[in-house]
């Protein structure tokens, strides 16, 4: 069997969700030594990086201006050391937003309930669209997908106060073109007196691990690349 | 204080529509959820529907689908629900209801339905 | 859509005495249940929200509890201004759906 490196980590930098016109930056985060990275764009090649020096950098960044429809899909890289190359990475869904119009979204029974209430979202949109996203704030990767011709809803609950946060909602043109986002709804639960303080789920800081972690190579950097590689794949 | 204020009654012809009016004061209209309720003549209560006047988001009960249709004047903090094709099983008590939890009741509009 | 079972459909009492009415969910509707009085001329008024939250100028001989799907609804000491009708009405799920209604009449 031919011999390859381990795949490298793909993210992109402060969100994968990327409003028209504004440029997307995307990680490729591999092995020091790398002499070259390709990102691939829905299976072909998009873009070639060759870090300078290779030995020193354990990653590069894809650049993306003006971002539209057209380069908004899939994106996975792969790097090579010498003559070998990696496996490739996973997928990295890359979204265009601002497209269109703007919905609205609001909540049922209100935005201040008590835990154990169940809660529904309801995000309209009238212009033409089929599929509608809700994500809350600080926790984008985890977006909910409903279908409507002009509404959908979200039922959620019976909530905790695992549920509090700002919510938003958007309208899809198809799976990576997104409408502008609606304003939040606060999402405010009280009561469950036991349970009040940071639950498990709740992020303490917005989409904390949407960041590259490229590094330049020092002595110590050496001994942990290793270290820094695994971290990255349990983090993921 | 809240207050939603509804026609006492209406006297339709069958097959003819009517639009009930319900008026809003004392909180801010466009924050809450508004349900439409019917109660017909020593029955029990039936939910219609509910709109949000902020953002135009309407949930129907799928048995009144075809029968009603919520919309809301911002300007005047008025909820209307049009009842289309009348009948007598129409005859009814319509109750406006403020706020996603049923808070505050309208005083009902009673439709009569009689040629 | 949830069924909701009222009983009993119909209680006579009297004056002082404690009387409980219950609402069984068909289905899962967490705590968002409330109770409703309805007068003789039609007005109605909530008195319980959130299955045990009391509405504001409700006397406190209402209460409101659950115990898995079975929810109820106690009037500690009836006075006379309680002999009317209740409803249950979940609001969890759309449609929502009212019980069929308890008629409290003085004994």
């Known amino acids: 069997p031919k011999q390859t490196l381990p795949k490298p980590i793909i993210r992109a930098e402060s969100t994968y969700m990327v409003p028209k016109e504004k440029q997307a930056t995307l990680c490729c985060q591999g092995s020091y030594g790398a002499v070259e990275y390709q990102l691939h764009f829905e299976g072909s090649l998009f873009a070639v990086e060759r870090p300078k020096p290779p030995e020193r950098i354990n990653g590069v960044k894809f650049h993306i201006p003006d971002m539209n429809s057209r380069k908004a899909g899939r994106y996975s890289c792969i790097y090579r050391v010498g003559e070998l190359w990696s496996e490739r990475s996973d997928l990295l869904d890359l979204v265009v937003t601002e497209m269109y119009d703007t919905p609205t979204l609001s909540v049922h029974p209100g935005p201040e309930v008590t835990s154990g209430e169940k809660v529904t979202f309801y995000c309209r949109l009238d212009t033409a669209t089929s599929m509608f996203l809700l994500l809350k704030e600080g926790r984008s990767r985890d977006v909910q997908r409903s279908y409507g011709k002009v509404q959908a809803e979200f039922p959620m609950g019976p909530v905790t106060t695992a549920h509090r946060g700002s919510y938003r909602c958007f309208g899809s043109y198809n799976n990576y073109a997104w409408s502008f986002p609606s304003e939040p709804v606060k999402l405010l639960v009280t009561g469950d007196i036991e349970n009040t303080s940071l639950a498990p789920t709740d992020p303490t800081f917005p989409d904390s691990w949407d960041t590259c972690l490229l590094t330049r190579e020092t002595g110590l950097q050496k001994d942990l690349a290793l270290w820094d590689h695994t971290a990255q794949n349990l983090l993921r | 204080q809240v207050q939603l204020q509804q026609p006492g009654a209406e006297l339709v012809k069958p097959g003819a529509s009517v639009k009930l009016s319900c008026k809003a004061s004392?909180?801010?209209?466009?924050?809450?959820?508004m349900h439409w309720v019917k109660q017909r003549p020593g029955q029990g209560l039936e939910w219609i529907g509910m709109?949000?006047?902020?953002?135009?988001?309407?949930n129907y009960n799928e048995k009144f689908k075809s029968k009603a249709t919520l919309t809301v004047d911002k300007s005047s903090s008025t909820a209307y629900m049009q009842l289309s094709s009348l009948t007598s099983e129409d005859s009814a008590v319509y109750y406006c209801?403020?706020?996603?939890?049923?808070?505050?009741w309208g005083q009902g509009t009673l439709v009569t339905v009689s040629a | 859509d949830i069924q909701m079972t009222q009983s009993p459909s119909s209680l006579s009492a009297s004056l002082g005495e404690r009387v409980s009415l219950t609402c069984r969910a068909s289905?899962?509707?967490?705590?968002?249940l409330n109770w409703l009085q309805q007068e003789p001329d039609g007005t109605i008024k909530r008195l319980i929200y959130?299955?045990?939250s009391l509405d504001s100028g409700v006397p406190k001989r209402f209460s409101g509890s659950r115990s898995g799907s079975d929810y109820s609804l106690t009037i500690s000491s009836l006075e006379s201004e309680d002999f009317v009708d209740y409803y249950c009405?979940?609001?969890?799920?759309?449609?929502?759906?009212f019980g069929s209604g308890t008629k409290l009449e003085i004994k």
């Open positions: 289905q899962d509707i967490g705590s968002s």
């Open positions: 709109i949000h006047p902020n953002s135009g988001s309407t």
């Open positions: 009405l979940q609001y969890a799920s759309s449609p929502f759906t």
């Open positions: 959130a299955t045990s």
């Open positions: 004392g909180y801010t209209f466009t924050s809450y959820w």
């Open positions: 209801v403020y706020d996603g939890r049923f808070a505050y």
